[in-house]
Structure formats: structure tokens, C-alpha cells
């Protein structure tokens, strides 16, 4: 028998230093977790004291935090090598900066392999991007060897940038030929590293002859067995099991996000490359596990430039930008429609002909809105004034919804009108009109969305059985501030940018903003 | 500072087996990797296998497959290893060694003497 | 498995003497630890990561090497320095160690 142990991260989304234990701002630093610091300290002390040892990441690295913003992929290769992964598979977040933001400080940068099977370059890209990243690596681990095949997510180009030379195939078709190859090549242990969520994770383990194990991402899936170290709740146990169909016990594993936990996965393989067992848990990075002394004066050296670009100006606004709560929590207010036009703007992605953009509407709950920007500072905007409209450190997520779930959320938004609490909604490409006189549930009167799939945009009635694509943020997907309609009907749910990163983006293209209050959200009383 | 205590010395028999202990202070016990090394009288040192307390999980050294065991009781902070079918080839002084966080083999206890005679 | 061949087995060095011993790996390695044994006590780690000195060893000790070469150096020698050196490689598994060198004092 032969050991290996995996030692996996996945969505980890720029969480360079540690965070609070809900991944947001260190603010206490004994009850802080994570950051590329102390993971060098566990993974060095598993490499010490075992044999065999992979450190492997299943993509979204980029995007999440300002040194994303400021870095723009520098950082990811820098502390990655540092840290000596193994092998990283790409996700969708590092086609954000497009591709020649993911080839130039990471793919050229790294000094380990960078996977993908089922993303093909084609055109001039297919020379420039060639061995750059591949479709497997074979490494050599003690006196063996294993091979470590790639896959992303084939809805990448509607999550981000990747162009038009990149064409994404489906998981399942292309691994198979390149898990055959290396069968070929006489390499009897595989790793299907990826990043296509959870159910597709299962789907490989299920359906791909000869693959051993699955390390996924993106769907930021926690599993765990026994009882949880820490706030999140397991999805199943670590590793989770599927018999795959040709009747094998492959092992599918994931380590949540953000560096919170290392996963840790030990297998046991017969001579034949069979696993025999497949045991561990993800190992929650706490504060009783040190930071390494020198990764953690490198990342006090990189924080320098920071905390310089988050006072420099980004643009400019020539109006009062009112995020006050006395307006966001009872009223259209021209910061929300700044923010979800800039959500919008996020998301504009012309894949098909038939449609201007694949999503055109935005929800965003005033309670998240923070703080208004005064125009009378020069109309200067920095980062900071930013990180006050928007300081918990979300992101705006694309999802799925039929048109009854919106209904209910634009219901909910307005059931206790007036009390100044965080769930009315503000909006992009939605025309609603509340009706205040009637009872709570029975309140919008009218709600008008703007197509998609149309070559002028105009508002058309909501259709309660029609899937509508809404960008909105994490908070929301998840639930918060009562809207548990969104969670528990959502078809589909793709986490996004980090929101400050969403907004500065679209400030420092504009240069100069002037949102105004335009009729988006109306009132009426009586019959409409 | 780490302190590994372990337990005294063993005379025993040829075919019998003897459990030794290792008992940690001053560490989180559970958060360091555990060695145990042999050393045969004015002889070098030989790794036997390592045990992570936290998880239970264990490796060892091929050549001793078979002929020991290692286990954790979290709960008094004591690491174990047992020997079996001993011979005079076993007969040697076997340490328990600590991983610190960031160095192998960072802390030692004094040693279990063991001597297998007729 | 992998092999550490030290030289020499024994030696002796007067105080004030430049103090080389070596280690020879069987394959190519990435780091050497090396510890230090007194007779009757334990060992103690000595050097880390091929030159990284532990707590309290003093700096007249310094390691270096790469590949399948290695050494420890004591610049010059004192009478506390007597006792045997060992490399531990955990480079390659099983780990293991080298057969020591027995530095003595003239």
C-alpha cells in the first residue's frame, strides 16, 4: 500500500492575511484565522512529519479583497510559490481582468502547473496561451507518480471575462480523454482538480472511468465529519463518497473558502493505483496555529502599497451621493442605483447574439448600504469612502429566479415599511410601484423588469413563471435580512466580485458619475 | 516549553511485547506531530514512525511495520508505543520526539531503556 | 531508501580549531537537519533547514549544502562542542539518519 496525503484549498478569493472568523477584516487578531501566513505553518508542519504530501488549489484564487484590486494577480503567484503548491486548476474569478490578466502575473509567474481540460484556445490566442496552462500534469510524489488532471466551470463566460478564444466544452466529455491518456501513460493514481461546484464534482467522481479522487471549488461546499470546529455547517461528510459507475468508492472533497481550513485528505492506494481507503477533515486554521515569521513580514512588505492606493482618487461624483439610511431604507436613493448600475456594468457579457446581455437587473438591500459620499471634497472618491458605503467585505453573486420568487422578495422588501430596517430593496432594471394602504404581502402593484433577450432594452411585465437571471449580493443569496425566499428557491447561484471592487471598477471607468434618483422604485395609493 | 516525560525501563522477555509511554506538558498536545526513534547501544538512530495526536493518523518507517504500534490517548496527553515479539535486536533505547511548529524533532524526552533477555 | 553517509566517524579538534564534518545523501535532497547528542542525554536538534541555528546553539556552528553534500562547521572550537553529530534527512521516506560523527576534544 502507498499514502498520499492531500492537502487542499479552494476559493480562497484574495484572503492574503487573516481574517474574522466570518472571513471579512481582521479586527481582533487572537480570534483571527487563516491568511497564506499560518497556512505555511500547517503545511509545513504536515510536509516535516509525512511522506507524500500534495498542496493542491481548486481555482478562485482572484478576486475578493483590495490586494486583488491593487496586486491583480501578482500576489497569487508570489504567495503560492512561496508556499509551494503543487498544482492549482483554474476557476472562473481568474478570467476577471480578462485573459491577459490571468497569462501575465499568473500563468507566466507560477512555478507550478496551472490546470484545465476543458478550456481550448483557439485564434491567434491558441499560440500565445500554448503550454501555459495544460489539461493534466503528472508529479512525481515520493516513488510514485500521480496525475493531477484540470477542469473550470463551463459557465465561465457568463461569470467573467475569459474573451472570445476560449471556448469552454464540458467537464465530463473532455476529462475523459485526457484521464484515458494518462492511463496510457501508465499513471494508475488521477485527481480530478477542479472548479465546477459540488454537484459536478459528484457528477466526474460518478461518471469519469478512472479517477480516484475529486478536489472541487466554487461552490464553497463544507463538508465535514464529526462535530465542526467552527460556525459553518457541513454539507456531508468529508470525504464525501460516490460509487462511481463502474462500481468504485471515489472520495469528493472540498475545504469551504477563503483559506478558513486546510482540507486534509489521506488515501491509501493498493499497487494497482486502487484506493483502498480515504480518510481526514478540513483542519481549521485558528489562532492557535502561528503564522510563519517570514511569509508574514513578506505580506507586511506588500501591505505597504495597500494602504496607499485606498486613499487615491478614483473618479469623480458631481452630486451628493446618498446613502443615508433615512432615504436607502424607505426610498429610491441614488447611491443604490449607483451601485447596482455598477453591479449591472459588472456583468455585461455579449454571448449571444439574441440577447444585449445575458442579466439585466439588480436587487440590493438598503440596510447594506452604509454611508453617503459628499461631492463637496472636490467630488474626490477613494477606495476608503467605498469601503465606509460598503464595509463588509460581500460580493454581488449572480443567481437564478422565477419570476414568483422576485414577486415574494418585493414583497418582502415593503411588509413593514417604515421602520427603517435593512430589507427594502433597491434596484437596477426594475420599475416597481408599492401600494402602501394594502396589507403587508399584498403591496406591489406593479413590477416591470428590462429584457434580455431584445436589441432595444424596455420594461415588460414580470412573468411568474419565467427564470430571470438577477445580480444581487451574497448577503441576499444567503438569505439575509429575511429573504429566506431567495435562498430556498434559487435555481442557481454563482458568487461574484468583491462589491468595493464592483463599484471602484465602475467609478474609475466613468471618471466622472451623477446618479440621480430616476423613478426605479414609485409609490401609489388606491387602484393602479 | 515542551517537556516529553516518558516511562521507565523495561526488561523483558524474548516474544513478549511492552508498551512504553510519552506524556506531553506545556504544548497543545493534540497540535504537534509525534516521533519515536530507536538507538541501539553506541549505535545511530533510527525513525520508527510518527503519529499526529489530533487525528489519530499515523505512518512508519517500513522496517518497523509489524513490530510497532503507535497510539494517542488525547484525554491524559500520552502518546504509546508498543513493541511486540521482541528480540534482542530490539533491545535499545527508543525516544519520543516532538515537532514544534516550525521545526522537526524540536523537543525529546530522556529516553525508555529496553532490554530483552532470557 | 536513502542513505546518509557521514565522515568522518570520529575525530578531535583542538580548542580554537576549525571544526568541518559532512553528510553525504544517497540522492538529492532539499534540506539537512542536524542534532546534536551528548553521551547519556537525548538528542537535540542542533540545525534546521540545512543553516538555520536552533535556540541557543552558538554561532560559531553554521550548516550549508545542497543537493547530496552537506556539512556542519564550527568556526572554532570549544570543550563543549564534544559530542556525536547526527543528519536527518526528510527529504525522502522513510526519513533517516546519518551514522553520526564523534567530535572529541584534544
Known amino acids: 500500500a502507498w499514502e498520499l496525503t492531500i492537502l487542499h484549498t479552494n476559493d480562497v478569493h484574495s484572503r492574503l492575511e487573516q481574517t474574522s472568523e466570518d472571513s471579512s477584516k481582521c479586527v481582533n487578531a487572537s480570534r483571527c484565522m487563516g491568511g497564506v501566513a499560518r497556512l505555511f505553518t500547517k503545511v509545513q508542519q504536515i510536509r516535516r512529519a509525512e511522506p507524500n504530501v500534495l498542496l493542491l488549489d481548486a481555482g478562485d484564487q482572484y478576486q475578493g479583497t483590495i490586494w486583488f484590486t491593487v496586486y491583480k494577480g501578482a500576489e497569487v503567484a508570489h504567495f503560492m510559490n512561496a508556499l509551494r503548491y503543487d498544482a492549482m486548476a483554474l476557476g472562473n474569478h481568474e478570467f476577471d481582468n480578462g485573459v491577459e490578466g490571468l497569462i501575465e502575473p499568473l500563468l507566466k509567474e507560477a512555478k507550478f502547473p496551472i490546470l484545465s481540460a476543458n478550456i481550448k484556445a483557439k485564434g491567434p490566442l491558441a499560440s500565445q496561451i500554448s503550454g501555459l496552462y495544460l489539461p493534466y500534469k503528472v508529479l512525481p510524489v515520493g516513488d510514485e507518480v500521480v496525475g493531477i488532471v484540470g477542469y473550470t466551470s463551463k459557465e465561465t463566460p457568463f461569470l467573467s471575462n475569459p474573451g472570445t478564444n476560449l471556448v469552454f466544452e464540458d467537464e465530463i466529455t473532455a476529462l475523459q480523454p485526457e484521464v484515458d491518456k494518462l492511463k496510457t501513460l501508465n499513471v494508475n493514481k488521477i485527481i480530478a482538480l477542479g472548479h465546477s461546484g459540488f454537484e459536478m464534482d459528484k457528477l466526474i467522481a460518478q461518471k469519469v472511468r478512472g479517477v480516484d479522487v475529486v478536489v472541487g471549488g466554487h461552490s464553497n461546499t463544507f463538508l465535514y465529519t464529526g462535530n465542526p470546529p467552527s460556525k459553518e455547517v457541513p454539507a456531508g461528510k468529508y470525504p464525501f463518497i460516490v460509487t462511481s459507475d463502474d462500481g468504485r468508492k471515489v472520495p469528493v472533497v472540498q475545504a469551504y473558502a477563503f483559506g478558513k481550513y486546510l482540507g486534509y485528505l489521506k488515501i491509501e492506494f493498493d499497487e494497482r493505483g486502487n484506493v483502498i481507503s480515504s480518510h481526514g477533515n478540513p483542519i481549521l486554521l485558528n489562532s492557535s496555529i502561528p503564522e510563519d515569521p517570514s511569509i508574514k513580514a513578506d505580506i507586511n512588505k506588500w501591505r505597504i502599497k495597500l494602504d496607499n492606493y485606498s486613499t487615491q482618487e478614483l473618479g469623480k461624483t458631481i452630486v451628493y451621493l446618498d446613502g443615508s439610511s433615512q432615504s436607502c431604507r424607505f426610498r429610491e436613493c441614488n447611491m443604490g442605483n449607483l451601485i447596482c448600475d455598477a453591479m449591472i456594468n459588472n456583468n455585461l457579457r455579449h454571448t449571444d447574439e439574441m440577447f444585449w446581455n445575458h442579466v439585466s437587473m439588480c436587487i440590493l438591500n438598503g440596510g447594506g448600504i452604509r454611508s453617503p459620499i459628499d461631492e463637496r471634497n472636490n467630488g474626490t472618491i477613494t477606495w476608503e469612502n467605498l469601503a465606509a458605503v460598503l464595509p463588509f467585505g460581500g460580493t454581488f453573486d449572480l443567481v437564478q429566479l422565477k419570476g414568483s420568487t422576485l414577486k415574494k422578495a418585493f414583497e418582502h422588501s415593503v411588509h413593514r415599511y417604515g421602520q427603517s430596517t435593512g430589507e427594502f430593496l433597491q434596484v437596477g432594471g426594475i420599475h416597481v410601484v408599492y401600494d402602501l394602504s394594502r396589507k403587508p404581502g399584498d403591496r406591489v402593484v406593479k413590477l416591470d423588469v428590462l429584457c434580455t433577450k431584445c436589441r432595444v432594452p424596455s420594461y415588460d411585465p414580470l412573468k411568474m413563471d419565467e427564470v430571470y437571471k438577477v445580480i444581487l449580493p451574497n448577503f441576499l443569496a444567503n438569505g439575509g435580512d429575511g429573504f429566506q425566499m431567495i435562498k430556498d428557491e434559487l435555481l442557481r447561484h454563482d458568487s461574484g466580485d468583491q462589491d468595493i471592487n464592483v463599484v471602484s471598477t465602475y467609478i474609475s471607468k466613468m471618471k466622472v458619475i451623477y446618479p440621480a434618483v430616476e423613478g426605479r422604485i414609485k409609490f401609489s395609493t388606491g387602484s393602479h | 516549553e515542551v517537556q516529553l516525560q516518558q516511562s521507565g525501563p523495561e526488561l523483558v522477555k524474548p516474544g513478549a511485547s511492552v508498551k512504553m509511554s510519552c506524556k506531553a506538558s506545556?504544548?497543545?498536545?493534540?497540535?504537534?506531530?509525534l516521533h519515536w526513534v530507536k538507538q541501539s547501544h553506541g549505535k545511530s538512530l533510527e525513525w520508527i514512525g510518527y503519529?499526529?495526536?489530533?487525528?489519530?493518523?499515523?505512518g512508519y518507517n517500513q522496517k518497523f511495520k509489524g513490530k510497532a504500534s503507535l497510539t494517542v490517548d488525547k484525554s491524559s496527553s500520552t502518546a504509546y508505543m508498543e513493541l511486540r515479539s521482541l528480540t534482542s535486536e530490539d533491545s535499545a533505547v527508543y525516544y519520543c520526539?516532538?515537532?514544534?511548529?516550525?521545526?522537526?524533532?524540536?523537543?525529546w524526552g530522556q529516553g525508555t531503556s529496553v532490554t530483552v533477555s532470557s | 531508501l536513502l542513505v546518509l553517509t557521514q565522515s568522518p566517524a570520529i575525530m578531535s579538534a583542538s580548542p580554537g580549531e576549525k571544526v568541518t564534518m559532512t553528510c553525504s545523501a544517497s540522492?538529492?535532497?532539499?534540506?539537512m537537519n542536524w542534532f546534536q547528542q551528548r553521551p547519556g542525554t537525548s538528542p537535540k536538534r542542533w540545525i534546521s533547514?540545512?543553516?538555520k541555528l536552533a535556540s541557543g546553539v552558538p554561532a560559531r556552528f553554521s550548516g550549508s549544502g545542497s543537493g547530496t553534500s552537506y556539512s556542519l562547521t564550527i568556526s572554532s572550537m570549544e570543550a563543549e562542542d564534544a559530542a556525536t553529530y547526527y543528519c536527518?534527512?526528510?527529504?525522502?521516506?522513510?526519513?533517516?539518519f546519518g551514522g553520526g560523527t564523534k567530535l572529541e576534544i584534544k
Open positions: 540522492s538529492s535532497i532539499n534540506d
Open positions: 503519529i499526529y495526536p489530533n487525528t489519530g493518523v499515523n
Open positions: 533547514d540545512t543553516s
Open positions: 506545556g504544548n497543545i498536545f493534540t497540535d504537534y506531530y
Open positions: 520526539a516532538s515537532d514544534s511548529w516550525f521545526f522537526a524533532m524540536d523537543y
Open positions: 536527518h534527512q526528510r527529504s525522502s521516506y522513510p526519513w533517516t
